[in-house]
Each structure stands twice: as C-alpha cells, then as structure tokens.
C-alpha cells in the first residue's frame, strides 16, 4: 500500500543537512524512486540531485579516508628517513670536524696546503650519499691522485716538477702504492658502507614517494557508484540505521582498490630488502664504523706516504727520470712526526641500534598495508555492522550479504558483484609505482652484495649535457676520467623531502 510506504524523511533531512547541503532539496515524505540512478528504485527520500550530491560526497569521503591512511604511513616513513639521514650525515660531519681539528697539528702544511682537497672529498662523499650520480671508486681514485701530486711537490720543493713529470707520477701511482693500504681499504669499506647507507635511505624515500603518488590516484566512476550504494543508499531507502555488512564493504573496497592491492608483492619485497640491508650497518665494514672514521684512513695514508718517502722518490725517479733541481729551491721537506691516529673503530653509540630496531618493527607493521587497506578502511571509516547478520545493509535492503569476499588485486575482481572492474586496464600510475618499487629493491639487493649500481633514476629521461670523458686538454691526462657526464644532481628518489644541503663553504 503506497500510503503506508509514505514515511517521513526526517532522519534523512537531518543527515543531509549535517553534510552542509540545502534542506530545500529534501522531500517531506518518501517519493517514488524511478529517477534513482545508483540506489535501488524503491520508495525513497532522495531526489536525483540528492543522490548525485551524496554520490560525490561518498567518493570524496573515501578519497579522504584513503589519503589519511596514506598520510600516516608517509609520516612514519618520513620520520624514519629523517632520523637515519641525520645520523649518517652526522657521522660524516663528525669525521670532517675531527679532521679539521686534528690534522693541522698532526701534519702541518701537508694538511693546510691541501685542505681544499680534503674538503672536496667530504663534499663528494656527501653528494654521493645524497644520491648524486657519481662513481665513488672514481671519486676516491681522483682524490688520491690529486693528493699524491700535491704532497709529492710539497715533500720535494727543491725539485722542478712540470706537468709532464706529474703526469708520469700519476701513471706510476697504482704500482707504487704511495699511501700504503689505506686507499684500497677505504675504497672497499667506504663503497660497501656508503652504498648500504644511501640505498637504505633512498628506499625509505621511494616507499614514501610511492605512497604519496598512489594516494593521488583518482577512484573511478564505477567505484563512486559502488561507494554511494554502500554508504548512503540505506539513507535514501529509509533504513538510515542499517550499517553496511562487513563482507559487502570489503567487496566494494577490494574492487575500488584493486590496483592498489597489486602493489603488495613488490612493496613486501622492498621492505624485506630494507630490513635485510640493515645487517650491513654493523661490523668493521659497517656504516657507523666506516663513515664516522674516514679521517683515520686519511691520516694513515699521509703517515704511510711520509714513511715511504725515500723509497717512493727512488721508484718515481726510476720510472719517470731524474727531475731537474731548482738551484734556488729549499732542501727537501723535513720528515714530520707521524700524525697521531685516533682508534679506527668507533665505539657504537647505540643510536643506530635504536634507530634500526624501531625501523624494523615499523616496516614489519606496514608490510601488508596495501592488501589490508580495504579491511582497515571498512572497519575504521565505514561504521560497519558488528556482525554479518540479517540486520546489516547489503546494498539492496536490510539483510544478510551472501556473495563471497573477493581475493586481492586486479585479476581477482573479475566477478566482483559490487564494482565493475575492467581487469584488462590496469592503472598506469600504479604500474609505474610497482616498477619504482622493483628498481629500488634491485638497488638494495645489489647494495647488500656490496655493489654500487647505476643510480640513474628510472623516471629520468636520461637527457642532459656534459663533455663526457672529453679530456681534450693536453694537460689533463692525470684526471681520472669521469665515465658518466654526470651532472652530479641528486636524483628524483635520492632523498625526497630533504633539501640538498650543499654547503656553501667560504673562506
């Protein structure tokens, strides 16, 4: 009997008004629902305009809920990133400060006349750590070549050493091992330590970036219809007290977030790789031990050069010929006392252990973020019915929800009864983010094995100018050619959200 159906729309008025919409749209009593496009077409308290407004609102509310969940995860990753980044930078800055404080006394002019070379080394290490596309081994080789040239000139001020003689010295250097074992040891340890540190921090950056970009992926029109039906059609159909059935909600959100769930496998791989690489933070080649002790390798190298000076000079003369002597020049530099070495092993401060255990726990907590998202949003944001009973809203009426819950991911939505999902059309933004996760995981795996990978970012078009090896100048044979015409700019995923902090050092 139509008259008995014609109930008051007071409750709907209240809910609709509370959402900020004009009450003039709301009928006083139920009307026939043939005009409804989304909700079942029974008697209703919703006009076409109301249905459209509520559909838009439900869409916006889901996107907000999705962004809120993402923001919490992003904030956690950003906090982790900043903590680790601060710690690693602090280790390197500490080492440089120690060098600046102790080397003048220990080495005198052998340091002060070469302060710029040491400053440059630390700057390059900082840039490398921050994700610049430069080759660490080349950078170190270049530093030792510069230093040898300058120190050799300083130790022999009485000799005439033109560029061609210095070029010859540079070519002999590898065989002569003028700095003893320090360069080799530093190269092996620093490569492993810096690669581990920077790839871990970059991993946090990539993870955060992926979450941010995925949160911006718009929900499609089919999802909007399904969410409207889930959230507000009960109001329109006069059962505003009926809460959505849990399985019904899950099916809607699994359909809506099908593409997001496809991130799961690569997301887990990334987090696993990040947890794994923290193993490389300990021991004699560990991050804390190496990054904080760069200066001790440098001191060892200068001491070795001074100790080997006579043998080295004899070998250089043997390989490069007798240099001319400056008749007005001073005698050879007096042998300085050995620079006092701080112990090479830094006692662990405990800070890194604390950071790592916190990070591991938090990364484990968010491993299933993408596949648990539908369940999380349903239980936290959708005011679900507490049980799958006959009293919950099943999308048509108050009653039991019978369809089974779909699996996770796009392919499993083929028969989703609530959201029409075209499984042949994956979202391209999400596919790109899956690729970013894969790339970063590969970097971390390479880093775990101590290998520096080409950190050219996948999203980079690879363009850029530079003069490549281009050492066309006849005086630069000494230079270690920089294989990449690297622009030394930190990459997209170097450290998202952190400023580059290229210190302007002034005299």
């Amino acid at each position: 009997d139509p008259a008995s159906k014609s109930r008051s729309c007071g409750e709907v008025r209240q809910i609709y008004g509370a959402k900020g919409f004009s009450l003039s749209d709301v009928p006083q009593a139920e009307i026939s629902g043939e005009h409804l496009r989304i909700c079942p077409q029974g008697y209703t308290c919703c006009t076409s305009e109301m249905e459209e407004n509520l559909a838009n609102r439900s869409h916006a509310e889901l996107e907000t809920a999705l962004r809120d969940s993402s923001r919490v995860l992003q904030a956690m990753l950003a906090t982790q990133l900043r903590s680790f980044d601060d710690h690693f930078q602090h280790l390197l800055n500490d080492s440089e400060r120690t060098l600046q404080a102790t080397f003048p006394g220990a080495f005198g002019e052998l340091y002060t006349q070469n302060a710029r070379a040491f400053r440059d080394l630390y700057s390059e290490l900082r840039l490398y750590y921050r994700g610049a596309n430069l080759h660490l081994e080349e950078t170190l080789a270049e530093f030792w070549a510069r230093l040898l040239e300058r120190l050799f000139k300083q130790l022999h001020p009485q000799l005439l050493l033109p560029d061609d003689y210095l070029d010859c010295l540079g070519k002999q250097a590898e065989a002569l091992r003028p700095f003893g074992e320090a360069p080799r040891e530093l190269r092996l340890r620093a490569t492993r330590a810096f690669v581990a540190a920077r790839s871990f921090v970059q991993g946090l950056g990539v993870a955060s970036d992926v979450v941010r970009k995925v949160a911006q992926v718009p929900l499609g029109p089919e999802c909007s219809r399904a969410v409207m039906k889930l959230v507000y059609c009960a109001h329109c159909l006069g059962v505003p007290g009926a809460r959505p059935c849990p399985d019904y909600c899950r099916n809607v959100l699994k359909g809506c977030l099908a593409n997001q769930a496809d991130l799961d496998a690569e997301w887990r791989n990334l987090l696993d790789s990040m947890v794994l690489i923290t193993d490389k933070f300990w021991g004699t080649s560990g991050v804390e031990s190496v990054i904080g002790s760069v200066h001790t390798w440098l001191a060892e190298a200068i001491n070795a050069l001074q100790d080997n000076r006579d043998t080295l000079t004899a070998k250089v003369i043997q390989g490069c010929g007798n240099p001319k002597v400056n008749p007005q020049g001073p005698g050879p530099e007096e042998k300085r006392r050995r620079g006092k070495l701080a112990p090479r092993e830094r006692p662990p401060s405990g800070t890194l252990e604390k950071l790592v255990s916190e990070a591991k726990a938090q990364l484990r907590d968010v491993q299933d973020f993408w596949i648990s998202l539908p369940g999380t949003l349903c239980s936290e944001k959708m005011a679900l019915s507490t049980a799958s009973d006959d009293r919950c809203w099943n999308g048509m009426a108050r009653g039991r929800y019978l369809p089974e819950v779909m699996g996770d991911g796009l392919a499993n939505q083929i028969n989703n009864p609530e959201v029409e999902v075209d499984i042949t059309k994956p979202d391209m933004t999400i596919r790109q983010q899956i690729m970013q996760l894969k790339i970063m995981t590969n970097r971390l795996r390479s880093a775990y094995n101590g290998n520096d990978v080409d950190f050219q970012d996948a999203s980079d078009d690879g363009s850029g100018s530079g003069s490549g090896d281009g050492c066309l100048d006849d005086l630069c044979s000494r230079k270690v050619s920089r294989k990449s015409s690297s622009s030394r700019t930190p990459l997209t995923h170097a450290l998202p959200g952190l400023s580059e902090q290229e210190g302007q050092k002034t005299s």
């Epitope: 440059d120 560029d163 210095l166 050492c471 066309l472 000494r478 230079k479 290229e502």
Partner: antibody, heavy 119, light 107 residues
Framework: QVQLVQSGAEVKKPGASVKVSCKAS????????MHWVRQAPGQGLEWMGE????????TYNQKFKARVTMTRDTSTSTVYMELSSLRSEDTAVYYC????????????WGQGTLVTVSS | AIRMTQSPSSLSASVGDRVTITCRAS??????LHWYQQKAGKAPKLLIY???NLQSGVPSRFSGSGSGTDFTLTISSLQPEDFATYYC?????????FGQGTKVEIK
Amino acid sequence: QVQLVQSGAEVKKPGASVKVSCKASGYTFTGYYMHWVRQAPGQGLEWMGEINPSTGDTTYNQKFKARVTMTRDTSTSTVYMELSSLRSEDTAVYYCAREKRDDGVFAYWGQGTLVTVSS
Amino acid sequence: AIRMTQSPSSLSASVGDRVTITCRASRSISTYLHWYQQKAGKAPKLLIYSAYNLQSGVPSRFSGSGSGTDFTLTISSLQPEDFATYYCQQSYSTPYTFGQGTKVEIK
C-alpha cells in the same frame, strides 16, 4: 680545446646586481675549479673567489664575501658570478678562469665581461 | 692576505734585450708562484707556473726562478710581441693575490 665563453657587457646603476655567466667546453666541466678575477680600468688583477663545479662548494675573497655569489649549472657546463650592491668602484672587466690542474694556476681564461656601474 | 710586490712598475727595453722582473711575497710561499702576460684589451695568458715551469706553448725565452719570498721572471731576448704587462700571482693560500703588474714598453 678548452674554451670559456662569457656573457656580454653590462651597464648597471649603483645598488643594482649583475650576474655574469661563463660557459665551459672542451673538457670535463666537473673536473676543475673555476675562478673569477676582475680588473678595474688601468688597474691590476684581483681574485674574487672560486667554485668547485662538481660539488658547488665556494671560497670567496673576504673583500667580496658579503656581495658575491658563485653558482654553477652542470647541465649546461656554466658557472655564474653575481655581484650585488654595485658601486662605481665595481666598474671592471670580470674574467672567469679555469685552473690548470688542482693548483690555483689559471691556465684558461674567458674573454672578459665589462661591467660598467654608473648613475 | 699575502701581499705580492712587483718591481719595477714599468720598464723600457729594446728588441733583443734581456729583461728581468722581480716579485716579492710578504711571506714564504714555497714555489706557489705563477707568471702571466697581458696585452691591452685581452685576457691574461699563463707563462710560468710553480715558479719555474714553462707553460705548454710558451716560447723558451721566458724563464722563472726563485722560492720562498723572492721570484724572478726573465725574458732572455725581448721580441716585439713581448711588449705587454706582466703579473705574478701566488696560490699558496686564499685569497689568491697578484702583483700590481710590470709594464714592458718599447724604448
């Protein structure tokens, strides 16, 4: 061969700023320090500062420290020198010069940029 | 800052003459001393680096000597193209500094 090509002459009013560019070619840009040296009309040479194109680190002559900024753009192999709060005494030819090797020796020079400061 | 003093400020000489220019540093700079030649309206050109090394492409009539605080640039036989201003420069410490220049004119 190594070439340093500077931007054209500038006329500025006192108090203004000037930004001179120096585009490098013929070598690995990030491999050598670049310096700026100026020469007032009929005067000698005066070193203003240096920049490491690889890291962006700079060292300035104390005399100019408050007014000079040196930057680089590695994608175009260009260094820049900006001098602010110009006064008439800043009228000079400004040269960029590349080190020979890591030694503070200026083996390659730009053609110079005349900056005239006049009201 | 290290002060560099050149002498003489100017000199007149004839083609074929032997010319000597001196440069004194206000403190010892080892051999971190370099010589440049500059012609009117042109950029300076490196002649000698590290006190005594001849830059590639520079004629062998130019030579340098000295160490510590006193340095000399010698042109063994002055040529017409050598009439120019000559500057010394130290790279021992920043700020790098130049001498005030020595102008070599035709007698």
